[in-house]
């Protein structure tokens, strides 16, 4: 009896694991083995696929084959007993295109009201993702073990901290990876659970803000108790993307070590241009708080988000305001290459009733003014990026009198 070729061959690639599955064509024939050949693009000869020769089951693993994952390959399979079936050719494929991202490895650390999630690729030193290691982003689903209400968090990197949790509570989460450049979404990790600790005696500092004064940065925060000492640390923000490395080398800000006030001042030249994370910790000499929430700090935005400069053209019933780039010392304009929104506040000089206009444009009309009346105007700039939500201080108020009636043409 002629052996029939196997059918429905499926190629599953997860990370660097290459698995083949197929159906037997004839279940009634026993002791059949199966063998695969492969062919690379541009080659005429077929090569035996190691790991997939004389297989008795309907599954084999050819992960040991060192393939160029960006190169198209073709497979064929046949059944063997005393004689052999004809070859069944599988549609050619490119391993990288076919590959799925496997479940990432997840490690958890618990605090009283926070969990730190360390994520690394499931396959260490993967060949499949060798060129994409730094491009992985992750998303996670987290829930309280007791409630099951899920919260999704998208676009996180290899270290992520979730705040505002409840003490002594078990949280569960699962994580999956994505390579957005290749439109690939991975499979979820197994569920990991961890219990937050008892509430710490000292809470972490809150509401950390950075501002610029002269040539210095001023870092301020709030704290519940008096007579504390604080320390501040920084980290390059890009280091949170570092896959597989669980050591984050937070550095002290020298002028912010063991400070006894809820603020510290340090020179702008402490930081080169870049995006940093900052965190603050409190201590009373015996106990130490956990670290505060980490805030993102962009030196370019921080240093150069100066109040806008503007000119006013006065009409009888309106002001035309022309916003220009703020001036640095030396009267050179600051180039701000990120989108800004302008907040303009104006009021009648004899009144405290302020009105507000929010505008993206740099020429703004303030309407519905009374003729021959003194109005004052001040303005500030906001960044449009919600992750780097920064605002300049207000400009000094400029007061102008509107023109007499009928000059609005």
């Amino acid at each position: 009896k002629n052996l029939k070729s196997p059918q429905k061959v499926e190629v599953d690639i997860i990370d660097d694991n290459f698995i083949l599955r197929w159906n037997r064509s004839d279940e009634s024939v026993g002791n059949v083995t199966f063998s695969f050949d492969y062919q690379k693009t541009g080659m005429d000869n077929w090569i035996k696929l190691s790991g997939c020769q004389n297989i008795t089951s309907t599954k084999c693993n050819f992960s040991s084959l060192k393939l160029n994952v960006y190169e198209e390959i073709k497979l064929r399979i046949r059944a063997e007993k005393e004689n052999t079936s004809s070859w069944y050719e599988v549609d050619s494929f490119t391993p990288f295109r076919k590959a799925q991202i496997g479940p990432p490895e997840v490690h958890l650390e618990a605090e009283d009201k926070a969990i730190v999630i360390h994520i690394s690729p499931g396959t260490k030193d993967s060949v499949m993702w060798a060129l994409d290691g730094l491009s992985f982003t992750y998303s996670l689903v987290i829930w309280k073990n007791s409630s099951g209400v899920e919260e999704r968090i998208e676009n996180i990197y290899s270290r992520h901290k979730i705040y505002k949790l409840s003490p002594e509570t078990t949280y569960c989460l699962k994580v999956k990876a994505a390579l957005l450049t290749s439109w690939k979404i991975g499979v979820y990790s197994p569920v990991h659970c961890i219990k937050t600790t008892v509430e710490n005696e000292l809470p972490p500092p809150e509401n950390i803000e950075v501002s610029v004064q002269n040539q210095n940065y001023v870092l301020k925060w709030d704290y519940t108790y008096a007579n504390m000492t604080f320390q501040v640390q920084w980290l390059h923000a890009f280091l949170k993307r570092n896959p597989g490395n669980h050591l984050y080398k937070w550095k002290q800000i020298p002028d912010c070590e063991n400070v006894k006030t809820t603020q510290c001042v340090f020179p702008q030249n402490v930081f080169q241009k870049g995006i940093y994370l900052l965190r603050v910790q409190a201590s009373d000499g015996n106990n130490t708080s956990f670290w505060s929430e980490e805030i993102k700090f962009d030196t370019e935005i921080q240093a150069f988000l100066l109040p806008p400069v503007f000119n006013i053209r006065s009409l009888s019933d309106s002001f035309h305001i022309y916003i220009g780039a703020p001036k640095q010392s030396g009267n050179t304009p600051v180039i701000q290459d990120y989108p800004l929104i302008y907040e303009i506040i104006f009021w009648e000089n004899t009144s405290n009733a302020e009105r507000k206009i929010i505008e993206k444009k740099t020429d703004v009309t303030v309407p519905n003014l009374k003729p021959l009346t003194v109005y004052c105007v001040k303005a500030r700039a906001h960044t449009m990026d919600e992750k780097l939500n920064k605002s300049s201080v207000f400009s000094d108020a400029v007061c102008e009198k509107t023109k007499p009636g009928n000059t609005s043409k």
């Epitope: 605090e111 490395n245 050591l247 106990n287």
Partner: antibody, heavy 118, light 107 residues
């Protein structure tokens, strides 16, 4: 294979100084912290301090401030512990260990025995 | 400084038994606790990090648990080669500190 190879045993006189070395293989010390730990005979482990070999930043236990100086040479992938003004209290085995953050001190050297005696 | 207290200096157990070594921190250290095993005449060997994660190559009869201030290393199905001293360590705050150690004796 990750290894930390420490320098040989030292017999030194009171008041003198000694410099111990810890040479790493199988990894780059710049990617980790290197810690030093003291253990006196039949006693527990005492943390001395650590260095970030990338920039030389150090942290010390208050007890060892002024006694211990930790340095590193990234070109030879080696960390050092210098102990000064030695007394019999400094007689101990000193270990270096690699520290990987979350993963703590995952690899240890074999230890260097320091004996302070006149 | 954070004090790590291993109240039992010695523990006696038999092959095949289950034993728990405890460690108490003087303040909340989250889950930043590691356990090390030191056999006579050898350097310490890392067993557990981040309270409950085993290093690769460590037999699964070693498990870590706890959080905050109370931590436990459990050895189930104790083997003769587990005769050693066990140290806990916190690495949440500088200076990092070790427990005094618990010596495991095999009956």
């Amino acid at each position: 294979e990750v290894q930390l190879q420490q320098s040989g045993a030292e017999l030194v006189k009171p008041g003198a100084s000694v410099k111990l070395s810890c040479t790493a293989s199988g990894f780059n010390i710049k990617d980790y912290y290197i810690h030093w730990v003291k253990q006196r005979t039949e006693q527990g482990l005492e943390w001395i301090g650590r260095i970030d070999p990338e920039d030389g930043e150090t942290k010390y236990a208050p007890k060892f401030q002024g006694k211990a100086t930790i340095t590193a040479d990234t070109s030879s992938n080696t960390a050092y512990l210098q102990l000064s003004s030695l007394t019999s209290e400094d007689t101990a085995v000193y270990y270096c260990a690699r520290f990987g953050g979350l993963t703590a001190m995952d690899y240890w050297g074999q230890g260097t025995s320091v004996t302070v005696s006149s | 400084d954070i004090v790590m207290t291993q109240s039992q200096k010695f523990m006696s157990t038999s092959v095949g038994d289950r034993v728990s070594v405890t460690c108490k921190a003087s303040q909340n250290v989250g889950t930043n606790v590691a356990w090390y095993q030191q056999k006579p005449g050898q350097s310490p060997k890392a067993l557990i990090y981040a309270t409950s994660y085993r290093y690769s190559g460590v037999p699964d009869r070693f498990t870590g648990s706890g959080s905050g201030t109370d931590f436990t290393l459990t050895i189930s199905n104790v083997q003769s080669e587990d005769l050693a001293e066990y140290f806990c360590q916190q690495y949440n705050n500088y200076p990092y500190t070790f427990g005094g150690g618990t010596k495991l004796e095999i009956k």
